[in-house]
Interface confidence: low
């Protein structure tokens, strides 16, 4: 049928609550395109009637709520004037009783459901709520081990739970809850989050803060030259090393023979309270083998990565 396929990672979801998935794949969906959702290769599109439990809402597919039998492969077809593109989403629905300790944890948790707090720091957790504009979300409540979180160390700010002076006892199972209103009906959204605590640097030293990168992907064409800065703030008297690594090896060592990827010379700017350090990584020529590898910037105990991503082809032409 001439559509080009892109396969997306599985989504693992909880039954009996709302779920939405947005069919977006820039730059394809940034132009004038029509988006149609289908289930399990059916020729009949998902309904656009807002009263339907499962319906398409603009580019989204919306489940109000998700049910056990909704598991399966959903396909989103993006049609442009001269193009057709298809995204596959494999939804697995499971029964999760958040407060039943006899039930096992979430299988294959995505990063949204695994979060880290930094010991001794002021930090935050994020409640990931992805829904179309037609869904109105009420205030978020936070729970730990099934008890609503209260206390002066905790502040709810929009979709975040601010935690001051993080302690080891803050690790555990959290949940964020919101009431979603759609077409006059109300639904409860409850997301579980497994929280772990990372230690601060020893000897009472402060943890360097990596301003950039932020654990994200960068779209870059094959064969191009790419330079990425790692920007780090640290105390003026720090003794931390800053470097780029790949596969747990210094990039200069890993690419010792080809010298195709190199670490740059570190520079820093001195401020009154701290220093801002910059050390870059240069890809002289991006190769296929570079895609999907986390290139890690290390600064003392802090790390952040970039992952190179192949840009979507220019689909306007065919």
């Amino acid at each position: 049928d001439g559509c080009k396929d892109i396969f997306m990672k599985n989504e693992i979801l909880s039954a009996s609550q709302p779920f939405a998935f947005n069919c977006t794949f820039p730059p394809i969906t940034s132009g004038e395109v029509s988006v149609t959702w289908y289930k399990n290769s059916s020729k009949i599109p998902v309904s656009k009637i807002i009263q339907s439990r499962i319906h398409q809402d603009e580019t989204w597919i919306l489940f109000l709520p998700m049910e056990w039998g909704d598991s399966g492969v959903y396909q989103c077809v993006i049609k442009g004037r001269d193009s057709c593109h298809r995204i596959h989403v494999n939804l697995t629905v499971f029964e999760k009783h958040w407060c039943d300790t006899s039930i096992g944890g979430l299988p294959n948790l995505s990063d949204e459901y695994k979060q880290i707090l930094h010991l001794g720091k002021d930090d935050s957790l994020t409640c990931h709520l992805h829904f179309p504009k037609s869904c109105v979300l009420g205030p978020i409540k936070w729970y730990k081990d099934c008890n609503e979180i209260k206390g002066e160390r905790f502040t709810v700010l929009e979709t975040r739970l601010l935690v001051s002076n993080v302690s080891a006892e803050d690790r555990g199972n959290y949940a964020c809850q919101a009431i979603l209103t759609h077409s006059g009906k109300q639904y409860e959204v409850l997301n579980g989050i497994t929280v772990s605590i990372t230690e601060r640097a020893g000897y009472g030293g402060s943890v360097p803060k990596i301003i950039y990168p932020k654990n994200h992907s960068i779209e870059v064409q094959l064969g191009t030259t790419l330079i990425v800065d790692c920007n780090v703030t640290d105390t003026k008297d720090n003794t931390n090393l800053r470097c780029w690594r790949v596969n747990n090896t210094l990039v200069d060592d890993y690419y010792d023979e080809s010298k195709r990827i190199r670490e740059g010379v570190e520079t820093h700017v001195s401020f009154r309270e701290h220093n801002l350090y910059t050390v870059n990584i240069t890809f002289l020529e991006v190769k296929m083998e570079d895609y999907g590898l986390p290139f890690m910037c290390h600064a003392g105990v802090s790390t952040a990565y970039i992952i190179l991503q192949l840009p979507a082809p220019d689909f306007r032409a065919y």
Partner: antibody, heavy 130, light 107 residues
Framework: EVQLLESGGGLVQPGGSLRLSCAAS????????MSWVRQAPGKGLEWVSG????????YYADSVKGRFTISRDNSKNTLYLQMNSLRAEDTAVYYC???????????????????????WGQGTLVTVSS | DIQMTQSPSSLSASVGDRVTITCRAS??????LNWYQQKPGKAPKLLIY???NLQSGVPSRFSGSGSGTDFTLTISSLQPEDFATYYC?????????FGGGTKVEIK
């Protein structure tokens, strides 16, 4: 060792049917789209049909659409090509091939880019003649 | 369907020569182009994928370049085992299509 082994070729009369099989081993079969490619005697390569890893999506060249059906049995690691209403011009060596895959993780998803056919079978000859 | 036009259809060259084969798509295919080598009686072998990436195990004398509609396969120094037929193929959209092939013969 990654291997593809075709079978089922032979001599068939015009209008007849034939079913080709391709047994895959040495790799995760469900992760790869698969294709059939043919080559008429003394001619170039022609892509015939393709199927996604799950088997949910199938694709055909115009020359075989409506006559050939591609399918796969992932429990048996086997790819099939059911050929009906065969014509003399379908005479060719038929190769089964694996579509190479590049996995590109993004923030919350992985994009799977299918590229060239990186593993090929030895081919099976189909002759359509009266 | 996207048409792939290869040129030349055949060429004669000597061992050590630099050989260039071109492939043109009837419309833009971004970088979704692959190159194959085929020897008589054998299955094709993937050489280059996504326009410029060398398939594992392929000698570095083979290289690919191009994007959009115009692509090139270069053999920097032709070796005796390189005498074969070479095909380009687009995997930009189905139906995938091959070029007509370029036969590289001994001069």
């Amino acid at each position: 060792e990654v291997q593809l082994l075709e079978s089922g070729g032979g001599l068939v009369q015009p209008g007849g049917s034939l079913r080709l099989s391709c047994a895959a081993s040495g790799f995760t079969f469900t992760s790869h789209a698969m294709s059939w490619v043919r080559q008429a005697p003394g001619k170039g390569l022609e892509w015939v049909s393709g199927i996604s890893g799950s088997g949910a999506n199938t694709y055909y060249a115009d020359s075989v659409k409506g006559r050939f059906t591609i399918s796969r049995d992932n429990s048996k690691n086997t790819l099939y090509l059911q050929m009906n209403s065969l014509r003399a011009e379908d005479t060719a060596v038929y190769y089964c091939a694996r579509d190479g895959i590049v996995v590109v993780p993004a923030a919350n998803h992985s994009y799977y880019y299918y590229y060239g056919m990186d593993v090929w079978g030895q081919g099976t000859l189909v002759t359509v003649s009266s | 369907d996207i048409q792939m036009t290869q040129s030349p259809s055949s060429l004669s060259a000597s061992v050590g020569d630099r050989v260039t084969i071109t492939c043109r798509a009837s419309q833009s295919i971004s970088v979704h182009l692959n190159w194959y080598q085929q020897k008589p009686g054998k299955a094709p072998k993937l050489l280059i994928y996504i326009a410029s990436n060398l398939q594992s195990g392929v000698p570095s004398r083979f290289s690919g370049s191009g994007s959009g509609t115009d692509f090139t396969l270069t053999i920097s120094s032709l070796q005796p085992e390189d005498f074969a037929t070479y095909y380009c193929q687009q995997t930009y959209t189905t139906p995938y299509t091959f070029g007509g092939g370029t036969k590289v013969e001994i001069k």
